[in-house]
């Protein structure tokens, strides 16, 4: 607010006032009169820049008059009282109400005193963020979508992620005239490593006390990525039972595991138990390539592992033996 005048009467008002679409707003405006100064106010006037005539007048004897009586009201001025507060309330704010307004006091003996106020009409946007479920494409595709609906002015959308990615932001008119819907897509080449990771959409707007953060959990659909664990190249005759595990990462989850060998079905010493393969003790050396084939809704992938059971001192190793 401008500082009060030192020796003269001064009109005090904020340079800018925000108001929300459809709501009411008060344009504050006061006459500041220094202690030793004498002034008499006979009229309060509000006018909008670029429009002919005044929109509201409070006259010392005629009282208030308005260009739109249902939408305007002097909040403090009263007949028979000192006219020092010209604050004006506007109801049912519309987009077209945004603009510059002049608040004016007709005073004696100083003459007219006025100040300009910028009325900013805001609309608070509604924000949503959602995942765009994708498959492996090898090309950059939208993986997350953030929408700020019905903001005035348009909201600012930014993305925060350790994964890289590029935003693609667009605007369209909102449902209410003068409002804007902002849509931002977060674009990246899909990979299995990204599946399940988070990205954050940050929406900033004049009407927010602080930015809104919306987290999106990414979804990438991909066929199984398969490996076999549990073998350390040190299996010997006489060792205890051992277990191999078919490790599969996929989205959606695997629907089936199938164990086999390069020669066909499993040998008798290998017993399939879903994702695991139980290797029973053997009494002669073997050299077999095992295959784990994993299926999900997107397809099947397999991993191979060559297992050797060698002769050697069982006492020195964890074993495959009958005990």
């Amino acid at each position: 607010w401008p500082p009060p005048g030192t020796g003269d009467v001064v009109v005090q008002a904020p340079t800018q006032v925000p108001g929300f679409l459809g709501d009411s707003v008060t344009l504050p405006c006061y006459l500041q009169v220094p202690n030793m100064e004498v002034t008499h106010v006979s009229q309060l006037t509000w006018a909008r820049h670029g429009e002919s005539g005044s929109m509201a007048v409070f006259h010392q004897t005629q009282g208030p008059s308005y260009s739109e009586s249902k939408r305007l009201e002097f909040v403090a001025a009263r007949l028979g009282a000192e006219l020092r507060n010209a604050s004006l309330r506007m109801f049912g704010l519309r987009v077209e109400d945004e603009g510059n307004y002049t608040c004016l006091f007709v005073t004696f003996p100083q003459g007219s005193r006025s100040v300009d106020i910028w009325l900013r009409v805001l609309a608070k946007p509604q924000n949503t963020a959602e995942v765009q479920k994708v498959q492996l494409t090898g090309e950059p595709v939208p993986m997350a979508r953030c929408v700020s609906t019905g903001g005035r002015p348009p909201a600012q959308i930014t993305w925060h992620s350790d994964l890289g990615g590029m935003p693609n932001t667009s605007q369209v008119p909102g449902f209410l005239s003068g409002t804007v819907t902002v849509t931002s897509l977060w674009i990246l080449v899909p990979s299995s490593q990204v599946d399940g990771k988070n990205v954050t959409c940050k929406v900033e707007h004049e009407s927010f006390e602080k930015p809104q953060l919306l987290t999106v959990n990414l979804t990438v659909y991909y066929p199984p990525e398969v490996s076999i664990s549990g073998y350390d190249n040190n299996w010997y005759l006489g060792q205890n039972e051992a277990t191999l595990t078919c490790d599969a990462r996929s989205n959606p989850e695997p629907t089936g595991y199938n164990w086999s060998t390069t020669m066909g079905p499993l040998p008798p010493f290998a017993v399939a138990q879903g994702a695991q393969l139980l290797i029973r003790p053997v009494d002669k050396p073997i050299n077999t390539t095992l295959i784990c084939n994993v299926t999900n809704a997107l397809g099947a992938r397999q991993a191979e592992l060559t297992v050797q059971v060698k002769e050697g001192p069982p006492s020195e190793h964890s074993g495959i033996s009958r005990n």
Epitope: V38, L104, G111
Partner: antibody
């Protein structure tokens, strides 16, 4: 009912002074500024000056500065306008008028004739 | 000082006519303009304040418009009793100034 009743016509010689009164009724005298406006015969209106009865604060048209004095008597709710060093071009009807930014009530007018 | 230039200075119109009187200020006066009617031998009577607001009791055939430097007083349907002189006045800044008047005659 608001009323502003002015004193009667005056005939004055050049160089003399005239004091016109304006007695008010029907409203609170101290709540409104009182002004004076003159109108030469067949001509337009000219603002002379005004006074706030409460504090006695005045404002004058520079054209009359030094020659005009506006005063009030709060006890009788009366305003006065005195114009000195009269010349023939000061011949006019002098009105008191209650100020509301514009002038909403006027006295009936006082004809002041300056002639040798 | 702000000059208020009124036109026309005199005009004649018939009962029922629409009459327009204009007033041009030499500088921006916002909406701080009043219009007065003065009948012969009487003091002026306030019709319009703040450029476009009618005083209570003033017939609605009288209307004012404008802001800035250009102002208009309109009588939508002239009546015989509207025979008078009309003045505009600015009260944006001191000294207050008036237009030179428009004398309206009835044909």
């Amino acid at each position: 009912e608001v009323q502003l009743v002015q004193s009667g016509s005056e005939l004055k010689k050049p160089g003399a002074s005239v004091k016109v009164s304006c007695k008010t009724s029907g409203y609170t005298f101290t709540e409104y500024t009182m002004h004076w406006v003159r109108q030469p015969h067949g001509k337009g209106l000219e603002w002379i000056g005004g006074i706030h009865p409460n504090q006695g604060e005045t404002s004058y048209n520079q054209r009359f500065k030094g020659r005009v004095t506006i005063t009030v008597d709060k006890s009788t709710s009366t305003a006065y306008m005195e114009l000195s060093s009269l010349r023939s071009e000061d011949t006019a009807v002098y009105y008191c008028a209650r100020w509301t930014g514009d002038f909403d009530y006027w006295g009936q007018g006082t004809l002041v004739t300056v002639s040798s | 000082d702000i000059q208020m230039t009124q036109s026309p200075s005199a005009m004649s119109a018939s009962v029922g006519d629409r009459v327009t009187i204009t007033c041009k200020a030499s500088q921006n006066v916002g909406t701080n303009v009043a219009w007065y009617q003065q009948k012969p031998g009487q003091p002026p009577k306030a019709l319009i304040y703040s450029a476009s607001y009618r005083y209570s009791g003033v017939p609605d055939r009288f209307s004012g418009s404008g802001s800035g430097t250009d102002f208009t007083l309109t009588i939508s349907s002239l009546q015989a009793e509207d025979l008078a002189e009309y003045f505009c006045q600015q009260y944006e800044s001191y000294p207050y100034t008036f237009g030179q008047g428009t004398k309206l005659e009835i044909k």
